[in-house]
């Protein structure tokens, strides 16, 4: 189920960001992958060019060089290079991060939090992270996500119910109310599909319009042809005729004055019937077998 909620969003204390290839490790840094931002006194796309301040005075580097003069660029703390809530302060040569409890490194990028610090909220279980050098992972209970299980998930927003099922997030569980013809935890099973679906007692499966039905053999009925049909249940014999179940259908024994397969035709007083002719060998009032 690729559309379902991941139970945790990764780990805290992952490796420092990978900067733009060639970015000077001594004079550049990045806040986004593939970026290269220069420390004070350095410039160029890879922060390898020392800034010359001979042409004019610049209160502070890094900068973009213009003809004959240096345009002041952002300070080393602009945009706050300190991760995880660290606070930045400028130093004569670059910057310094004051890291919150549980983080360390040049830019507070390394997590010093361990499982003993109880970083997983909302019932999350802390896995790994036995010491400050190994990162921990929070396994979050269903309904929560984030590095620390701090985010409540609207699991229905990911539309986990298939085939038009209605999603209900009960907090502790997710329910899919399936449309007619579908079943399963995510409404993934198509009950209206003939594939792998047998009709009992010699019935055949017929698909059509996104639904299936069983065309049942004579004498059987119901959704899967499992019920023995009573052909007389619907009172098919008209005008008081009596119905008899028969191995191949039903037979109507007509009341006097009526004839036909279902006793639907009155016999006229002069002996003629409403039918063009009675079937050979049959007199009015004889049982008529319904085919």
């Amino acid at each position: 189920y690729p559309y379902d909620v991941p139970d945790y969003a990764g780990m805290l204390g992952s490796a420092p960001l990978v900067c733009r290839a060639g970015c000077s490790p001594e004079h550049g840094f990045c806040e986004q992958p593939g970026e290269c931002r220069c420390l004070e006194g350095w410039t160029g796309p890879l922060c390898t060019v020392p800034v010359s301040t001979s042409s004019c005075l610049s209160p502070r580097g890094p900068s973009s060089a213009t003809t004959g003069c240096l345009v002041p660029g952002p300070g080393p703390c602009d945009g706050n290079p300190c991760a995880n809530g660290g606070s930045c302060s400028e130093t004569p040569r670059s910057f310094e991060c004051t890291c919150p409890r549980g983080f360390y490194g040049l830019r507070c990028e390394v997590s010093g939090v361990t499982c003993a610090d109880g970083p997983c909220f909302n019932g999350g279980l802390c896995v790994g992270g036995a010491d400050p050098d190994s990162a921990y992972i929070c396994h979050c209970p269903p309904g929560f996500q984030g590095s620390n299980c701090e985010k409540r998930v609207d699991r229905c927003s990911l539309q986990p119910c298939r085939n038009g099922g209605l999603c209900l997030d009960l907090g502790h569980a997710l329910r899919c109310r399936c449309r007619a013809g579908f079943a399963g935890p995510r409404c993934e099973h198509d009950l209206d599909d003939c594939a792998g679906r047998a009709c009992a007692n010699g019935g055949t499966c017929v698909e059509g319009g996104g639904a299936h039905r069983c065309s049942c053999a004579l004498g059987f009925g119901g959704r899967d042809c499992r019920e023995r049909a009573d052909p007389c249940a619907a009172r098919p014999c008209a005008h008081g005729g009596r119905c008899y179940a028969h191995f191949s259908g039903l037979v109507c024994a007509c009341a006097p004055g009526y004839m036909g397969a279902r006793c639907e035709f009155p016999v006229h007083p002069d002996g003629a019937s409403a039918l063009p002719a009675a079937p050979p060998g049959l007199r009015p009032g004889d049982p008529q077998r319904y085919l």
Epitope: D7, D117, G118, F121, N122, G123, P141, P142, G184
Partner: antibody, heavy 118, light 108 residues
Framework: QVQLQESGPGLVKPSETLSLTCTVS????????WSWIRQPPGKGLEWIAY???????NYNPSLKSRVTISLDTSKNQFSLQLSSVTAADAAVYYC????????????WGQGTMVTVSS | EIVLTQSPGTLSLSPGERATLSCRAS???????LAWYQQNPGQAPRLLIY???SRATGIPDRFSGSGSGTDFTLTISRLEPEDFAVYYC?????????FGGGTKVEIK
């Protein structure tokens, strides 16, 4: 209320692999984590592993090299395999549902006794 | 791993008496993620308490839990005949999940 039922052989030979299956009585298998716990005769409880339908698993380090847990949502089942069994693995094995508010266990199967003997 | 030590190993009491069971952790149990279970002979354990002090569904109010950090207590205010059983604590703050060795509450 949902019910859990363990199934599998009650007798396993030493060095062989123990395979157990737990059947969940309703369609809630995608809503919870599911776990295996064992209890040797006359002793305490030991957690073995848990699994979530997204693929997340977690194993007790003391058993990790020998244990595999898997889940089949279409059958409403999850399974345990424990390889290279010894007499020390003889226990009542329980499957259990992980509570929705933390990794405690709120629904348990009745347990199945596994004996290891040649 | 966090080791849970339960005491006493056996508690002999009479029906109607108060039972106090202890569970001590080798290190801090984060966020009071501690549960208590009851197990009768030949049966599976039953969840009584989670989050150190919250009663699970259908558990009578004579059962109560307390504690934080490394020391936790299960109290049964008035023992009923069906309460004589083995009780286990379990921490679920840090993997691996661990159980205490159990306390048997028997009839005096």
């Amino acid at each position: 209320q949902v019910q859990l039922q363990e199934s599998g052989p009650g007798l396993v030979k030493p060095s062989e692999t123990l395979s157990l299956t737990c059947t969940v009585s309703d369609n809630s298998i995608s809503n919870y984590y599911w776990s295996w716990i064992r209890q040797p005769p006359g002793k305490g409880l030991e957690w073995i592993a848990y699994i979530y339908y997204s693929g997340t698993t977690n194993y007790n380090p003391s058993l990790k090299s020998r244990v595999t847990i898997s889940l089949d949502t279409s059958k409403n089942q999850f399974s345990l395999q424990l390889s290279s069994v010894t007499a020390a693995d003889a226990a009542v094995y329980y499957c259990a549902r992980v509570f929705h508010w933390g990794f405690a266990f709120d629904i348990w199967g009745q347990g199945t006794m596994v004996t290891v003997s040649s | 791993e966090i080791v849970l030590t339960q005491s006493p190993g056996t508690l002999s009491l009479s029906p109607g008496e108060r039972a106090t069971l202890s569970c001590r952790a080798s290190q801090r149990v984060s966020n009071t993620y501690l549960a208590w279970y009851q197990q009768n002979p030949g049966q599976a354990p039953r969840l009584l308490i989670y989050g150190a002090s919250s009663r699970a569904t259908g558990i009578p109010d004579r059962f109560s839990g307390s504690g934080s950090g490394t020391d936790f207590t299960l109290t049964i205010s008035r023992l009923e005949p069906e309460d004589f059983a083995v009780y286990y604590c379990q921490q679920y703050g840090t993997s691996p999940l661990t159980f205490g060795g159990g306390t048997k509450v028997e009839i005096k």
